[in-house]
């Protein structure tokens, strides 16, 4: 469960991948499509606010509160619209909701390897996003194997202006 | 009660070789990420190694990279640091901490254990 | 590497004094930053994460602000128990790296 309502903390951020591939939202026919892209030197990194939660993992073999703490993060590239597993369907998309969030919209936040990050879904453990075809998508990933997986690693860049379309 | 001990710290020749352990207990240590830092006798404290929970990943300060090795056995509970040609610059007490987070090492350290003293010395 | 660069390195107090130690990155790590406080012969001890958290069972008196490059750690009204060496630590990337660390001694 999610240990408090409010985040402990937010940061505004440009999304890229592994290999510098900007993660852009783009309004098409009343809805937002994500994409993966190299940008064009001139064009501005679409910003996305991360917002960080602390949530305890199911069981406690302590039961004491030390045991088992994560680090989940929402994402929202502009206001009131939020990422959101869809597990059906193997894709990330974009809903726009109200709060409480969906538990679709709420990730496990791994770091890893060359200081990147990655995205596991509250929802479906196991399951990351990741990049498919120069979309975002779900992957699952054997823990034994991929972990450092390069499609499922992403970079966070800081953005200074704290202001949030 | 959650802790930490470590053992292993002597004294050395430069040169040589130790190997440092640390014993877990009150937490499922198999979740967690740890890490070993170390101060140096007047001076501040310094990062040296961490290892994620499986033991899959591991990190290294530029200092010690080629010359520390840090494992971990989940069924003993228990982190490891191996030492490698060690200088007087290794002097220092050596901590085993562990990460506020399973999976990320955004929230710092919030548990550690007493240290282990290593001393360098011809 | 980042670098974390603290200041003062020393600072002399009163209980019941407020004092305010500072913790610049050399590049920007969002909020992740970390405060420790460490006594002679004691471990180090979480007292602030995420930049602004207090860490469970510390006192209130411990406060810090901050984001990006600039942090502050905050004691509200000095107790004898809180001379000791304070740390910032930057949590956002490897090699983690701490501040040379602040000493706090009684005036």
């Known amino acids: 469960s999610i240990t408090g309502i409010s985040p402990i903390t937010e940061s505004l951020a440009s999304l890229s991948t592994y290999n510098d591939q900007s993660i852009t939202f783009a309004l098409e026919d009343e809805s937002y499509e994500i994409y993966v892209e190299d940008l064009k030197k001139d064009k501005k990194k679409d910003k996305v606010l991360l917002s960080y939660y602390e949530s305890q993992h199911p069981s406690s073999e302590s039961g004491d509160g030390v045991d088992g703490k994560m680090l989940m993060v929402t994402l929202s590239p502009t206001k009131d619209f939020w990422l959101q597993a869809n597990n059906k369907e193997h894709s990330v998309e974009l809903h726009k909701c109200e709060k409480p969030l969906p538990d679709q919209a709420f990730f496990v936040l791994h770091n890893r390897s060359f200081n990147c990050v990655s995205f596991e879904c509250k929802t479906d453990p196991g399951v990351f996003i990741g990049v498919k075809d120069n979309h975002l998508a779900l992957i699952k990933v054997d823990y034994s194997e991929n972990l450092g997986s390069e499609n499922i690693l992403f970079k966070l860049s800081e953005i200074h202006h704290h202001h949030h379309h | 009660e959650v802790q930490l001990v470590e053992s292993g710290g002597n004294l050395e020749q430069p040169g040589g070789s130790l190997r440092l352990s640390c014993t877990a207990s009150?937490?499922?240590?198999?979740?967690?990420?740890m890490n070993w830092v170390r101060r140096a006798p007047g001076k501040g404290l310094e990062w040296v190694s961490g290892?994620?929970?499986?033991?899959?990943?591991?990190y290294y300060a530029d200092s010690v990279k080629g010359r520390f090795t840090i494992s971990r056995d989940n069924s003993k509970n228990t982190l490891y640091l191996q030492m490698n040609s060690l200088s007087a610059e290794d002097t220092a007490a050596y901590y085993c901490?562990?990460?506020?987070?399973?999976?990320?090492?955004?929230?710092?350290?919030?548990?550690w254990g007493h240290g282990t003293t290593v001393t360098v010395s011809s | 590497d980042i670098q974390m660069t603290q200041s003062p390195s020393s600072v002399s107090a009163s209980v019941g004094d407020r004092v305010t130690i500072t913790c610049r990155a050399s590049?920007?790590?969002?909020?992740?930053l970390a405060w420790y406080q460490q006594k002679p012969g004691k471990a180090p001890k979480l007292l602030i994460y995420?930049?602004?958290s207090l860490q469970s069972g510390v006192p209130s008196r411990f406060s810090g602000s901050g984001s990006g490059t600039d942090f502050t750690l905050t004691i509200s009204s000095l107790q004898p128990e809180d001379f000791a060496i304070y740390y910032c630590?930057?949590?956002?990337?490897?090699?983690?790296?701490f501040g040379q660390g602040t000493r706090l001694e009684i005036k």
């Open positions: 290892i994620s929970g499986s033991g899959g990943r591991t």
């Open positions: 009150g937490f499922t240590f198999s979740r967690s990420a």
């Open positions: 901490a562990k990460d506020s987070y399973t999976t990320s090492w955004y929230g710092g350290m919030d548990v």
């Open positions: 995420a930049a602004s």
């Open positions: 590049q920007g790590i969002f909020s992740w």
């Open positions: 630590q930057q949590a956002n990337s490897v090699p983690i790296t």
